[in-house]
Amino acid sequence: SGTTNTVAAYNLTWKSTNFKTILEWEPKPINQVYTVQISTKSGDWKSKCFYTADTECDLTDEIVKDVKQTYLARVFSYPAGHVESTGSTEEPPYENSPEFTPYLETNLGQPTIQSFEQVGTKVNVTVQDEWTLVRRNDTFLSLRDVFGKDLIYTLYYWKSSSSGKKTAKTNTNEFLIDVDKGENYCFSVQAVIPSRRTANRKSTDSPVECMGHEKGESRE
């Protein structure tokens, strides 16, 4: 089971949004296949995506076991048609990934405005709580469950007739804002983890929702 003519993987990159986590790498295989291993700093290596011709491996099931742990992955290269043999002593070429801590590094997915309701001069805007694949006691957790008060939402809201965007913030998934009676407003939200110091502290903005459309309700 020689490993001649296999090249080590390179450009190992974590792609993670709302804890859905995929390891990607290069090159596209020619006459070789890959196996991925993942471990925590103190744990044992666990093999995933055995002898795959893909250049990505979904590691979500492993990282959601403890999103605050730091993980390391490695990608082994084998000749195409390789079959594991117990007598093999030669270690195939492999490359390590950067370390990855899901809680600190997963990107925040684009949020969605679930609903808004106007009562007089107040509008209640609700952000949809996204479900993740993180579990506690066999129950899937929402983004809010996982991040708690570390996650805030910024609401941008503006009169349909003007360009200036007012803002409000919440550490729940609800906003209650003051509006002018008889005016139509538009809304967009952004998820933020202010404690992060890196480029993944903000989500992209939600789609804009405006009053007078189907998501809203108005009551006097």
Partner: antibody, heavy 120, light 107 residues
Framework: EVQLVESGGGLVQPGGSLRLSCAAS????????IHWVRQAPGKGLEWVGY????????YYADPVKGRFTISADTSKNTAYLQMNSLRAEDTAVYYC?????????????WGQGTLVTVSS | DIQMTQSPSSLSASVGDRVTITCRAS??????VAWYQQKPGKAPKLLIY???FLYSGVPSRFSGSRSGTDFTLTISSLQPEDFATYYC?????????FGQGTKVEIK
């Protein structure tokens, strides 16, 4: 180290224009919100406006609405305050400040300020 | 816009004194109130955030509290370097607004 450095202040005649810069280092402005705040001589702090460089959204205080424009160049990691139709009452030290968009913290870092004097 | 009414506008105190400055918001601002210290010719510095939390590096003699829409900054034992102007600010909603400032002078 987080730093904000304002520049571009000076003496300008009423009705004139000036562009202030706020150069950021130690962080990426598109990950934060940048505000401009001014302080007239011997007076208190007055908020001018903000920009979220990640989406270009802005909002302005009523006294400057229609005259001042805030923009950002993320490639230069710099925010700008374009001031047109300047009036004597716009004379002030202008500060830029970083907003971490936290529910809890407001402006955690400020620049040293740049003085704008509007006088004939 | 939310008004922040700060009092007193100035006060004279001695080193070691306990000093209290108050701010009243014209409507509910939750705990979204910050306190800043400003010395002549310098930019403001954040002291207290979220009404009662001490910002990193700020001495523990500074504290903040909230009761409804009333907010208080307390300096438990005034030090020579504390003579400055103090501002409250609400950042609950746009536009963020500042109190008028309180100048703490040496008696």
């Amino acid at each position: 180290e987080v730093q904000l450095v304002e520049s571009g202040g000076g003496l300008v005649q009423p009705g004139g224009s000036l562009r202030l810069s706020c150069a950021a280092s130690g962080f990426t402005i598109s990950d934060y919100v940048i505000h401009w705040v001014r302080q007239a001589p011997g007076k208190g702090l007055e908020w001018v406006g903000y920009i979220d460089p990640s989406n270009g959204y802005t909002y302005y205080a009523d006294p400057v609405k229609g005259r001042f424009t805030i923009s950002a160049d993320t490639s230069k990691n710099t925010a700008y305050l374009q001031m047109n139709s300047l009036r004597a009452e716009d004379t002030a030290v202008y500060y830029c400040a970083r907003d971490p968009q936290s529910f809890y913290i407001a402006f955690d870092y400020w620049g040293q300020g740049t003085l704008v004097t509007v006088s004939s | 816009d939310i008004q922040m009414t700060q009092s007193p506008s100035s006060l004279s105190a001695s080193v070691g004194d306990r000093v209290t400055i108050t701010c009243r918001a014209s409507q509910d601002v939750n705990t979204a109130v910050a306190w800043y210290q400003q010395k002549p010719g310098k930019a403001p510095k954040l002291l207290i955030y979220s009404a009662s939390f001490l910002y990193s590096g700020v001495p523990s003699r500074f504290s903040g509290s909230r009761s409804g829409t009333d907010f208080t900054l307390t300096i438990s034992s005034l030090q020579p370097e504390d003579f400055a102007t103090y501002y409250c600010q609400q950042h609950y909603t746009t536009p963020p607004t500042f109190g008028q400032g309180t100048k703490v002078e040496i008696k």
